[in-house]
């Protein structure tokens, strides 16, 4: 058993049928010695008396808010949560496996630049009685500071018969140098509590590996005289690290017909302009990627050919 | 410890091409190592990230773009002195700091070159003959060093009398390639910045 926060405790259980569970001793936080009784949740049934209460925690019915009283007055509370270990592996019932970039990915994180700011998000089908708490650090043995905000519900979507909820959090490394070469990964730890179930999820990454630039901005077309060709131009996104000559991007320019089946013409360039043939009803899209370290491509920025 | 903006004319920077070749070569070599050594811990998640140049050179700090010198987190006070006569500098007005930056890069390349050559000698003794260092990568390191053209004491190749542990050597190769790829990215960024300045 360990303390998650004041008066909230997590009991770790080896979870299998007929498991013996864990013996837990609760102590009433009071100078009083006699006349103390114990109850669980809203029940008025007295579970025991005395300054300590010994219970055998086996299942969720044994978890909850234990309260000690004296003469009708509440003295203190202890909330017991359960953390299930199933055949040596901690349960992952609360969050959905996003399966990207690989199986068992519960937390996904992205950064728009090298400033040390990043966003993580996760999915669940649970809509109520759900709380999250996020901590982060650079490295684990001698951790350096990363500050995270509160997790918020960022999207809701319908998937088949189920509703899916997306939560996200923003974090900022306390003293980040955009040009630094990372040798210790960022660690992100999410505590999830659903009713009386506790779970924790972790992700470990280097900022360089989760970079995904914003799409190029100010995408414009300039027709070339007496030609079907156009000059496409764009700019680095505002959120990208500066100076741009040091944090350079490379670009992919795509001409896409109305029909998805039509052949796509693609050009790769390090410049912020390109000359392409603009077909009728086609659109031109441009996306960006770090020129020197191949992390994710940005989303496409698009303009119609007409 | 920053790079001045008024430096060589655009396109007059012969090291840019070599640094791009270097990044391409080390990236290909790392990919090959990850595929060949699939049963070894060779992915970024599995290896320890060690920097053999730590406390010996200070490339990131010495090559910091002027715009980042206002960022206190970037100003680690690790001073290292270097020789200052490089031929990548197409202008005579090169500041001391830029020479310091380029000589720091040169020292990095020299250290990695020695490590890779020592390692290759061990890998050639492996009866499994599973993996060797790409000669193209070693050649590209050499070309960039020549383009930088710093006079520096030659570091003797390390020779080991004991029987090599091939498993450990292959893991060390992965660690070295990961670190060298990160340094090659920094070198490419620096050369691109200097070329644009």
């Amino acid at each position: 058993i360990w303390e998650l926060k004041k008066d909230v405790y997590v009991v770790e259980l080896d979870w299998y049928p007929d498991a013996p569970g864990e013996m837990v001793v609760l102590t009433c936080d009071t100078p009083e010695e006699d006349g103390i009784t114990w109850t669980l949740d809203q029940s008025s049934e007295v579970l025991g008396s005395g300054k300590t209460l010994t219970i055998q925690v086996k299942e969720f019915g044994d978890a909850g808010q234990y309260t000690c009283h004296k003469g009708g007055e509440v003295l203190s509370h202890s909330l017991l949560l359960l953390h299930k270990k199933e055949d040596g592996i901690w349960s992952t019932d609360i969050l959905k496996d996003q399966k990207e970039p690989k199986n068992k990915t519960f937390l996904r994180c992205e950064a728009k630049n090298y400033s040390g700011r990043f966003t993580c998000w996760w999915l669940t089908t649970i809509s109520t009685d759900l709380t999250f708490s996020v901590k982060s650090s650079r490295g684990s043995s001698d951790p350096q500071g990363v500050t995270c905000g509160a997790a918020t519900l960022s999207a809701e979507r319908v998937r088949g018969d189920n509703k899916e909820y997306e939560y996200s959090v923003e974090c900022q490394e306390d003293s980040a140098c955009p040009a630094a070469e990372e040798s210790l990964p960022i660690e992100v730890m999410v505590d999830a509590v659903h009713k009386l179930k506790y779970e924790n999820y972790t992700s470990s990454f280097f900022i360089r590996d989760i970079i995904k630039p914003d799409p190029p901005k100010n995408l414009q077309l300039k027709p070339l005289k007496n030609s079907r060709q156009v000059e496409v131009s764009w700019e680095y996104p505002d959120t990208w690290s500066t100076p741009h000559s040091y944090f350079s991007l490379t670009f992919c320019v795509q001409v896409q017909g109305k029909s998805k089946r039509e052949k796509k013409d693609r050009v790769f360039t390090d410049k912020t302009s390109a000359t392409v043939i603009c077909r009728k009803n086609a659109s031109i899209s441009v996306r960006a990627q770090d020129r020197y370290y191949s992390s994710s491509w940005s989303e496409w920025a698009s303009v119609p050919c007409s | 410890r920053n790079l001045p903006v008024a430096t060589p004319d655009p396109g007059m920077f012969p090291c840019l091409h070599h640094s791009q070749n270097l990044l391409r070569a080390v990236s290909n070599m790392l990919q090959k190592a990850r595929q060949t050594l699939e049963f070894y811990p060779c992915t970024s998640e599995e290896i320890d990230h060690e920097d053999i140049t730590k406390d010996k050179t200070s490339t990131v700090e010495a090559c910091l773009p002027l715009e980042l010198t206002k960022n206190e987190s970037c100003l680690n006070s690790r001073e290292t002195s270097f020789i200052t006569n490089g031929s990548c500098l197409a202008s005579r007005k090169t500041s001391f700091m830029m020479a310091l930056c380029l000589s720091s890069i040169y020292e990095d390349l020299k250290m990695y070159q020695v490590e890779f050559k020592t390692m290759n000698a061990k890998l050639l003794m492996d009866p499994k003959r599973q993996i060797f260092l790409d000669q193209n990568m070693l050649a590209v390191i050499d070309e960039l060093m020549q383009a930088l053209n710093f006079n520096s004491e030659t570091v003797p190749q390390k020779s080991s009398l004991e029987e090599p542990d091939f498993y450990k050597t292959k893991i060390k190769l992965c660690i070295l390639l990961h670190a060298f790829r990160i340094r090659a990215v920094t070198i490419d960024r620096v050369m691109s910045y200097l070329n644009a300045s």
Epitope: D14, Y16, P17, D18, E59, F60, D87, I89, D93 | -
Partner: antibody, heavy 115, light 112 residues
Framework: QVQLVESGGGVVQPGRSLRLSCAAS????????MHWVRQAPGKGLEWVAF????????YYADSVKGRFTISRDNSKNTLYLQMNSLRAEDTAVYYC????????WGQGTMVTVSS | QSVLTQPPSVSGAPGQRVTISCSGS????????VKWYQQLPGTAPKLLIY???QRPSGVPDRFSGSKSGTSASLAITGLQAEDEADYYC????????????FGTGTKVTVLA
């Protein structure tokens, strides 16, 4: 004492369907994940499928994906395996088992796919 | 196709010590715990070892398990006639959990 009893096995022609059941007693069935495991005659153990305690997630071996469906009815304390498009290579003893460090197995039910 | 490899058979005289190996990789045994099962002819598998080296109550202390790196092993000391059976190791892969990974199985023969 936990007890698992499989039923529904038998002889069936290739391409046909069969539904296996696993009745659980002596256990808070709705609290635990459940597996199906099979064993072809003279061969080793092969995992078939898994279902979470609440039925929210299901996992399948590649060899049965798209043909077999695992399900459970927690009100009836019963686990099911719906087997469609059966093949000769599905011939085996099918066991249900609880998920956990200490597991419980049923006695198995024989499925024979033969023309 | 099992990814946990066991020797097809091992044998020993009564009273002898035999060991069965179970070889995996970093993503399965290297990252997860190992179980061992005993299967007597015509019966369901019976749990012998869980969490690499723990014995459930009722399993004789002649059976012991261990794990090192990407391999595990089961040792039977003081071999007895009733130990003649098939033995399977089981683990998980970190990317496909909760799919059970079983070993190829080992037939233990007690020599007369």
């Amino acid at each position: 004492q936990v007890q698992l009893v499989e039923s529904g096995g038998g002889v069936v022609q290739p391409g046909r369907s069969l539904r296996l059941s696993c009745a659980a007693s002596g256990v808070t069935f709705s609290s635990y994940g459940m597996h199906w495991v099979r064993q072809a005659p003279g061969k080793g153990l092969e995992w078939v499928a898994f279902i979470r305690y609440d039925g929210s997630n299901k996992y399948y071996a590649d060899s049965v994906k798209g043909r077999f469906t695992i399900s459970r009815d927690n009100s009836k304390n019963t686990l099911y395996l719906q087997m469609n498009s059966l093949r000769a290579e599905d011939t085996a003893v099918y066991y249900c088992k609880t998920h956990g460090s200490h597991d419980n197995w049923g006695q198995g039910t024989m499925v024979t796919v033969s023309s | 196709q099992s990814v946990l490899t066991q020797p097809p058979s091992v044998s020993g005289a009564p009273g002898q010590r035999v060991t069965i190996s179970c070889s995996g990789s970093r993503s399965n045994i290297g990252s997860n715990t190992v179980k061992w099962y005993q299967q007597l002819p015509g019966t369901a598998p019976k749990l012998l070892i869980y969490y690499n080296d723990q014995r459930p109550s009722g399993v004789p202390d002649r059976f012991s398990g261990s794990k090192s790196g990407t391999s595990a092993s089961l040792a039977i000391t003081g071999l007895q006639a009733e130990d003649e059976a098939d033995y399977y190791c089981q683990s998980y892969d970190r990317y496909t959990h909760p799919a059970l990974l079983f070993g190829t199985g080992t037939k233990v023969t007690v020599l007369a």
